[in-house]
């Protein structure tokens, strides 16, 4: 806390300008009126205040707005945002996307801080859902944002927002998250033609069920191995050799290099060796000829 001291004669600030950078902390406290600061917040970012001076300015705003800052002030916080705690931010009601963008810009290039996470949480909760414009903004600043959400949180993403998602935004998503996002993407892109649809849906396929993979295998999509390796193992296992061959097209040769890795390894174990041999890739580990394959999971389901 800065002690309350009288402002020296002639030092009372009439406006927020560069002359204030020469004020000591106690002078800023004594000579800058909080209401003046609030109305001229847009000037603060244009003045090279030190961290210590920003502390004083924050203190003044806190005294003026003990219940939380109005959005007109929040939008112009600039570097002062770095001084805010999550507790401060929880008092705010941020509704404008422009305000959100302005504050994210301050933290640009740095890891998502607890302050930023709190800000985003407040903003999204205030909007009720993660709409396209918000998602666009968040993934522009934090490409991994989508994958930081829980499956429950992702369930509030409307299918229309999926258009804003870029492949790199899904890089760190796990299967549980893709399970939620895939049906939304399927819905969002449903009116696209075959090849365009595949380009858009490709990054979401880690959440695709077997029947959708079977359908894709009929469309000459030529899925690359990187995408195939990210598919759900349980979705890949029921695919026949012919279906995988059609799904991968010319990329089928890549199976050999991946034969020891999931899901390829587990898929090989489920195929007849005869069928694998038709690929001419030298894949080994299939079911030998003459063996009967019992699908016990089907038997359990029937009983």
């Amino acid at each position: 806390e800065v002690e309350k001291t009288a402002c020296p004669s002639g030092k009372k600030a009439r406006e927020i300008d560069e002359s204030l950078i020469f004020y000591k902390k106690w002078e800023l406290e004594a000579c800058v009126d909080a209401a003046l600061l609030a109305t001229q917040m847009d000037r603060v970012n244009a003045i090279p205040f030190t961290y210590e001076q920003l502390d004083v300015l924050k203190h003044k705003l806190d005294e003026l707005y003990p219940q939380g800052y109005p959005e007109s002030v929040i939008q112009h916080l600039g570097y002062l945002f770095l001084k805010m705690s999550p507790e401060d931010i929880r008092k705010w009601n941020v509704t404008s996307l422009e305000t959100l963008k302005a504050l994210l810009e301050v933290n640009k290039g740095h890891e998502m801080s607890p302050q930023v996470a709190t800000l985003i949480d407040r903003f999204v909760k205030g909007r009720g859902q993660l709409d396209k414009d918000t998602l666009d903004t968040l993934t522009a600043f934090y490409p991994g944002y989508l994958c930081s959400l829980s499956p429950e949180e992702l369930s509030s993403v409307p299918p229309s927002s999926i258009w804003a998602v870029r492949p790199q935004d899904l890089d760190t998503c796990d299967p549980r998250q893709l399970d939620v996002l895939y049906p939304k993407a399927r819905l969002a892109f449903q009116n696209m033609n075959g090849s365009e649809y595949f380009v858009k849906i490709q990054s979401f396929l880690g959440g695709a069920p077997t029947e959708d993979l079977k359908a894709l295998s009929q469309q000459n999509v030529s899925m690359d191995l990187a995408t195939f390796m990210k598919l759900r193992t349980d979705a890949v296992l029921p695919l026949t050799v012919a279906e995988v061959q059609k799904l991968l097209g010319p990329h089928v040769e890549g199976l050999k290099a991946e034969e020891r890795h999931r899901p390829v390894r587990d898929w090989i174990l489920r195929q007849r060796q005869d069928d694998l041999d038709t690929l001419g890739l030298g894949l080994q580990g299939g079911i030998p000829n003459g063996y009967l394959v019992l699908d016990l999971s089907m038997q359990e389901a029937l009983s």
Partner: nanobody
């Protein structure tokens, strides 16, 4: 790792000009305000100029105002200090530094270059 590399220093006659450059990594450059400081022998490090990442605002120390110009090239991730009408008292090691905020205080700058010597002879 953050790296700031200055260049362009040298020996120049009073009244002459020099242009200092400071190359930064793309990440540092896009997420930081950049400043120039100088330190003469036996003296404290002194603020020279800064350029604000947000809004591009610029601030100069009174001692260099009207003579020095700070600028940046986003495509090259480089900040410059164009120095003209140089005086013997401008002799110092010039440092480039980056900060998360737009500040005139050396304490607020996290990363520093190795410095480049500027000598102005009379």
């Amino acid at each position: 790792e953050v790296q700031l590399v200055e260049s362009g220093g040298g020996l120049v006659q009073a009244g002459g000009a020099l242009r200092l450059s400071c190359a930064a990594s793309e990440r540092t450059f896009s997420s930081s305000s950049m400043g120039w400081f100088r330190q003469a022998p036996g003296k404290e490090r002194e603020f020279v100029a800064a350029i604000n990442r947000i809004g591009g605002h610029i601030y100069y120390a009174d001692s260099v105002k009207g003579r020095f110009t700070i600028s940046k090239d986003n495509a090259k991730n480089t900040v410059y200090l164009q120095m003209s009408s140089l005086k013997p008292e401008d002799t110092a090691v010039y440092y480039c530094a980056s900060s998360r905020i737009y500040s005139h205080s050396a304490r607020d700058y996290d990363y520093w270059g190795q410095g480049t010597q500027v000598t102005v002879s009379s």
